[in-house]
Interface confidence: low
């Protein structure tokens, strides 16, 4: 009796859904009464399926309402654990242990990515100095550097602060501000570069025409 896994590493994005799968040999009709399926992540119990029933009382609170064993897949010889709305805390090593005549187990690693995809940006003007203040803010994991560049490929020096997200403890809230004297229609880019990751996320900021009071416009 040997369990197989089609993948032993899953890399998914924060907030997405994932199905981890272990396969086991089934002859003809599956006998649910002798099948035992356990899914665990490190020391957290996720699924305990015994005598044809799942025991909801053993499930670790962090998986409540988000993790389920896909029962229809059992008849195909698949112990499929579906996790919805994946959190950063879900990252780790999962173990499926199956008894069905014999017993076996396999380990599967889940990695969770949180790219700085949604970048919020603002442009304001300091009325005293006439400097433009460009701000980019995004949430992700792990920490990110923010690189400011102009359309003529100049690298500029911004000020970046990193705080914890209010949405999820492990997410970082990264805000970067660039103060610069510039003119209308100039284009600037803020690029979030996650430490240890090749994929970058960039937002484009176009300096708008200066706002003129309509009354002043009529006097010109």
């Amino acid at each position: 009796f040997t369990i197989t896994v089609s993948k032993d590493l899953y890399v998914v994005e924060y907030g997405s859904n994932v199905t981890l799968e272990c396969r086991f040999p089934v002859d003809k009709q599956l006998n649910l009464l002798v099948l035992v399926v356990y899914w665990e992540m490190e020391d957290k119990k996720i699924i305990q399926f015994v005598n044809g029933k799942e025991d909801p009382n053993v499930q670790h609170s962090s998986y409540h309402g988000r993790a389920q064993l896909l029962k229809d897949q059992l008849f195909l010889g698949k112990a499929a654990l579906q996790i919805t709305d994946v959190k950063l805390q879900d990252a780790g090593v999962y173990c499926c242990l199956i008894s069905y005549g014999g017993a076996d187990y396999k380990r599967i690693t889940l990695k969770v990515n949180a790219p700085y995809r949604k970048i919020y940006h603002t442009i304001s003007v300091d009325p005293v100095t006439s400097e433009h203040e460009l701000t980019c803010q995004a949430e992700g994991y792990p920490e990110a550097d923010v690189i400011w560049t102009s359309s003529d490929h100049q690298v500029l020096s911004g000020k970046t602060s990193i705080t914890s997200s209010k949405r999820e403890e492990k997410l970082f809230n990264v805000t970067s501000t660039l103060r610069i004297n510039t003119t209308a229609d100039k284009i600037f880019y803020c690029t979030f570069r996650r430490l240890g990751h090749e994929e970058n996320n960039t937002a484009e900021l176009v300096i708008p025409e200066p706002y003129l009071d309509p009354a002043k416009k009529r006097n010109h």
Epitope: T2, T4, V5, S6, K7, D8, L9, V36, Y38, E40, E42, D43, V93, C95, L97, S99, A103, D104, Y105, R107, T109
Partner: antibody, heavy 118, light 113 residues
Framework: QVQLQQSGAELVKPGSSVKISCKAS????????MHWVKQQPGNGLEWIGW????????KYNQKFDGKATLTADKSSSTAYMQLSSLTSEDSAVYFC???????????WGQGTLVTVSS | DIAITQSPSSVAVSVGETVTLSCKSS????????????LGWYQQKPGQTPKPLIY???NRHTGVPDRFTGSGSGTDFTLIISSVQAEDLADYYC?????????FGPGTKLELK
């Protein structure tokens, strides 16, 4: 840090049984598979089987089926191996080894020497 | 059962030399589903417990010096110890954990010249 402390050497008579222990500390005992390995002088290493302490599931090398019985006590974080109907062939050092995520025996006990002699 | 053979059974080296240990299995240890070879290398010094060096044929365990390098795939595997140190003198075992029962080779004894 992770430690596996095994019981001391045993001198036993042929035909009898012996139960050796392996006390784990420094990690969550219930969520790692505990393997047992036999080593005879000049005979290399032989895998006996594993136990999953959380549920008591076991898997044996067929060669040791009926010879070795693996159990675990969650409350004391201790794994046990009982060897029965002992013969001189069972004289060996027995190791417990805890498995990490990559199905590799990462943490080993110091070994228990079992000598079967009349 | 999968049979594992190791060669040489013993080898004598001088400190600073490079040594190559061989391990062969009677069937492929490559698991096609994830393209990993389920082979490990262990070091056992006299009177001590085995210490894991390499998993999945090529991955070093945490804290293992980079002079230990695992290579190979399928049925033929190699452990290279470059610039051998006195503390490397030990028995080296390879073992497979793809198919039950898990099996080990008879070992290679690394001795000082």
């Amino acid at each position: 840090q992770v430690q596996l402390q095994q019981s001391g050497a045993e001198l036993v008579k042929p035909g009898s049984s012996v139960k050796i222990s392996c006390k784990a500390s420094g990690y969550t005992f219930t969520s790692n598979f505990m393997h047992w390995v036999k080593q005879q002088p000049g005979n290399g290493l032989e895998w006996i089987g594993w136990i999953y302490p959380e549920y008591g599931n076991t898997k044996y090398n067929q060669k040791f089926d009926g010879k070795a019985t693996l159990t675990a006590d969650k409350s004391s974080s201790t794994a046990y191996m009982q060897l029965s109907s002992l013969t001189s062939e069972d004289s060996a050092v027995y190791f417990c080894a805890s498995e990490e995520a990559v199905i590799s025996l990462v943490y080993w006990g110091q070994g228990t020497l079992v000598t079967v002699s009349s | 059962d999968i049979a594992i053979t190791q060669s040489p059974s013993s080898v004598a080296v001088s400190v600073g030399e490079t040594v190559t240990l061989s391990c062969k299995s009677s069937q492929s240890l490559l698991y096609s589903e994830n393209q990993k070879d389920y082979l490990g290398w262990y070091q056992q010094k006299p009177g001590q417990t085995p210490k894991p060096l390499i998993y999945w044929a090529t991955n070093r365990h945490t804290g293992v010096p980079d002079r230990f390098t695992g290579s190979g795939s399928g049925t033929d595997f190699t452990l290279i110890i470059s610039s051998v140190q006195a503390e490397d003198l030990a028995d080296y075992y390879c073992g497979q954990y793809l198919v039950y029962p898990f099996t080990f080779g008879p070992g290679t004894k690394l001795e000082l010249k």
